[in-house]
Interface confidence: low
């Protein structure tokens, strides 16, 4: 019998390299059985995760899984950082692994840098 616990399928240490000025959708894959859980996004700030209250979000429903999406329209330099989604379900709080956005300012790079370049050229990152 399939478990009816809510599950959030963000992979551990997942990352996205994106350009400032582009639109971007950050997906939180959510699996649930009956009632849709209350899902929110937060951004990590040190040891706390600050809830993103006034950001546009949406649901994308697919056959076997749903995606709770955080919209960046457009991506801003200060969107750089780590994010986590969490679900409230039957009084339980389920938290995802964090996912990190590496934002490159288009004025600083003529082309999208690789992850290795990001690591070796931290000045490209806005923190």
């Amino acid at each position: 019998k399939e478990s009816c616990d809510v599950q959030l399928y963000i992979k551990r240490q997942s990352e996205h390299s994106i350009l400032a000025g582009d639109p971007f959708e950050l997906e939180c894959p959510v699996k649930y059985c009956a009632n849709r859980p209350h899902v929110t996004w937060c951004k990590l700030n040190g040891t706390t995760c600050v809830k993103l209250e006034d950001r546009q979000t949406s649901w994308k429903e697919e056959k076997n899984i749903s995606f709770f999406i955080l919209h960046f329209e457009p991506v801003l330099p200060n969107d750089n950082g780590s994010y986590r989604c969490s679900a409230n379900f039957q009084s339980n709080l389920i938290e995802s692994h964090s996912t990190t956005l590496y934002v490159t300012d288009v004025k600083s790079a003529s082309e999208r840098p690789s992850k290795d370049e990001m690591a070796s050229r931290p000045w490209l990152l806005y923190r």
Epitope: P23, A34, N35, R36, P37, H38, V39, T40, E53, Q56, T57, S58, W59, K60, E61, E62, F68, H71, E73, N88
Partner: antibody, heavy 120, light 108 residues
């Protein structure tokens, strides 16, 4: 200011297909969910279904077997097709935009509605 | 499907009076998944409240929403002539999205 305008025939014969289009002006159809809602004369509101600008859909199970909602981002339009109509499908049909908040949604912009009568 | 039940069906009040409209869900919809709409004859519904208590853009402060779980309330603190209309609640906790049957606020 976002505006929505429904268009389509006001009279459909029983067993035929009802086809309506909603044209969005004053804003892009992209990055939003769009919905159809209907209201039989003198009665309450019934949600029909929604479509995301990417084409992802979800329909009311009570109508699912008869509904198709599609989107044409190039024309800033989305459409409803309801097949095998009966007199019970006579209603004012509204298109609406979804406002997304936290993990829920409401309808913030509505068309003025179009009355569709099913009669032979 | 979550069934939304509104009461009373009709509320007869005078301008200046306080209106209290009730909406009950057949199962818990949390506090964040309830909206209220106003509809006048021949017009489309207008969003008043979402997330149970957040006023939509341009909605006067005399409209307020409260409640959680299965019981929600829309309060109009002092009825204005333009407030006489039908009011609907709507849940979006679970699909399909469902509306209540409406409460008509009429002039006494």
């Amino acid at each position: 200011q976002v505006q929505l305008q429904e268009s389509g025939p006001g009279l459909v014969k029983p067993s035929e297909t009802l086809s309506l289009t909603c044209t969005v002006s004053g804003g892009s159809i992209s990055s939003y969910y769009w919905s159809w809602i209907r209201q039989p004369p003198g009665k309450g509101l019934e949600w029909i279904g929604y479509i995301y600008y990417s084409g992802s859909t979800n329909y009311n199970p009570s109508l699912k077997s008869r509904i198709t909602i599609s989107v044409d981002t190039s024309k800033n339009q989305f459409s409803l097709k309801l097949s095998s109509v009966t007199a019970a499908d006579t209603a004012v049909y509204y298109c609406a935009r979804v406002i997304l908040y936290s993990s829920g949604w409401s309808f913030d912009y509505w068309g003025q509605g179009t009355l569709v009568t099913v009669s032979s | 499907e979550i069934v939304m039940t509104q009461s009373p069906a009709t509320l007869s009040l005078s301008p200046g009076e306080r209106a209290t409209l009730s909406c009950r869900a057949s199962q818990s919809v949390s506090s964040s998944y309830l909206s209220w709409y106003q509809q006048k004859p021949g017009q489309a519904p207008r969003l008043l409240i979402y997330g149970a208590s957040t006023r939509a853009t341009g909605i006067p402060a005399r409209f307020s929403g409260s409640g959680s779980g299965t019981d929600f309330t829309l309060t109009i603190s002092s009825l204005q002539p333009e407030d006489f209309a039908v009011y609907y609640c709507q849940q979006d906790y679970n699909l399909p999205l469902t509306f209540g049957g409406g409460t008509k606020v009429e002039i006494k």
